[in-house]
């Protein structure tokens, strides 16, 4: 005799990286005939939907008009069938951006290097956090966590042309607030074309994540996305 | 801009009744969430009850059954109906909104809440 009902997807629209003030949209995608849906933050309930007619209905959304840091951390959540609930979705968390400041990110030997050099970048924030994060666009895209007072450095080892692409970094005040984004640096890696098949894959973000977050930043428009795999945040735990 | 104004507050013997309303300003009264939250003295501020924008409902188990939470999108007016109160009852009320949002969605945490009301204290005592 079956105790639970599967556990359900959580996702954010347009993106787990939410501007301060801007707005988010946290979706919960069940079963069919769920007569009620809960969502629960930091292990407080949140929210609380009952969609009508439950048969009809498989996903709920919780809107957010005004993010800031009180909101940021840690959703799950469960639904009903009857009297039987599911399991608790696996965790999304939930970032505040664009707080406080703005962090400068720099890349030595230089932006343009050769494959096979060895390439650092330093991501430096005047203000009060230790935490920094790197993140890369695009499909291949890397998140590396860096310590330091006011700089955190990011050795990627001797590059290949997969290392091409742009970075941007922030700063983190805790594992849910981080800093704007820094302008973004462009990594040019010439070399040799044969290694790039060899090159290690790491797909932790989709492709249009950062066009995704830009898209927040600047408009705040809420855009429809594919539910995808929020391994990216496990970067967070 | 919101603005959430609250009445109705006052004193009442135990078991007595009350009616609290809560005016909202402005034109999106309808695409709003509203909810009750109280906050008796030295203590925090707790959720009472909730009205999803399609009249859904949701209350804290220590009121259900004596308290309903209802709005007139007519008026701009969200109440909560209380009665058998009890002396654990008082607190000062507050109305607060959740706009925009979705039809159904019901919110239960006080972070959500991005519009507050000034306050109506109720007092319980014989």
């Known amino acids: 005799q079956q105790q639970t009902l599967p556990k359900p997807f959580i996702w954010a629209e347009p993106h787990f990286m939410v501007p301060k003030e801007k707005q988010v949209t946290i979706c919960c995608q069940g079963n069919y005939g769920a007569v009620e849906y809960q969502l629960h933050f930091e292990g407080s309930l949140f929210a609380v939907d009952r969609p009508k007619p439950p048969e009809r209905i498989n996903k709920v959304k919780f809107y957010i008009p005004d993010m800031n840091s009180r909101m940021a951390g840690q959703y799950s959540c469960i639904y009903r069938v009857g009297e039987l609930w599911s399991e608790p979705s696996n965790l999304l968390d939930l970032v505040v951006t664009e707080m406080y400041d703005t962090p400068t990110l720099s890349v030595h030997p230089g932006p343009e290097v050769i494959s096979g050099e060895k390439v650092t970048f330093y991501c430096r924030l005047d203000t009060a956090t230790s935490m920094f994060l790197l993140l890369k666009e695009g499909r291949s895209s890397h998140v590396q966590r860096g310590y330091g007072k006011v700089q955190a450095e990011f050795p990627l080892g001797p590059v290949t042309t997969a290392h091409r692409g742009t970075y941007r970094c922030f700063g983190s005040y805790n594992n849910h607030a981080w800093s704007f984004p820094s302008e973004p640096v462009k990594l040019l890696v010439t070399g040799d074309i044969e290694n790039t098949s060899l090159a290690p894959e790491d797909p932790t973000f989709p492709a249009d994540t950062w066009g995704t977050y830009l898209l927040t930043t600047e408009t705040g428009l809420q855009k429809d996305h594919a539910l995808w795999d929020h391994t990216a945040q496990n970067l967070l735990r | 801009e919101v603005q959430l104004v609250e009445s109705g507050g006052g004193e009442v013997q135990p078991g007595g009744s009350l009616r609290l309303s809560c005016a909202a300003s402005?034109?999106?009264?309808?695409?709003?969430?509203m909810g009750w939250f109280r906050q008796a003295p030295g203590k925090e501020r707790e959720f009472v009850a909730a009205?999803?924008?399609?009249?859904?409902?949701y209350y804290a188990e220590s009121v259900k059954g004596r308290f309903t939470i209802s709005r007139d999108n007519a008026k701009n007016t969200v109440y909560l109906q209380m009665s058998s109160l009890r002396a654990e009852d008082t607190a000062v009320y507050y109305c607060?909104?959740?706009?925009?949002?979705?039809?159904?969605?019901?919110?239960?945490?006080?972070?959500?809440?991005?519009?507050w009301g000034q306050g109506t204290l109720v007092t319980v005592k014989p």
């Open positions: 607060a909104a959740v706009v925009p949002t979705y039809g159904s969605s019901i919110y239960v945490h006080s972070a959500a809440y991005n519009y």
């Open positions: 009205i999803s924008r399609s009249d859904d409902t």
């Open positions: 402005g034109r999106t009264f309808a695409s709003a969430a």
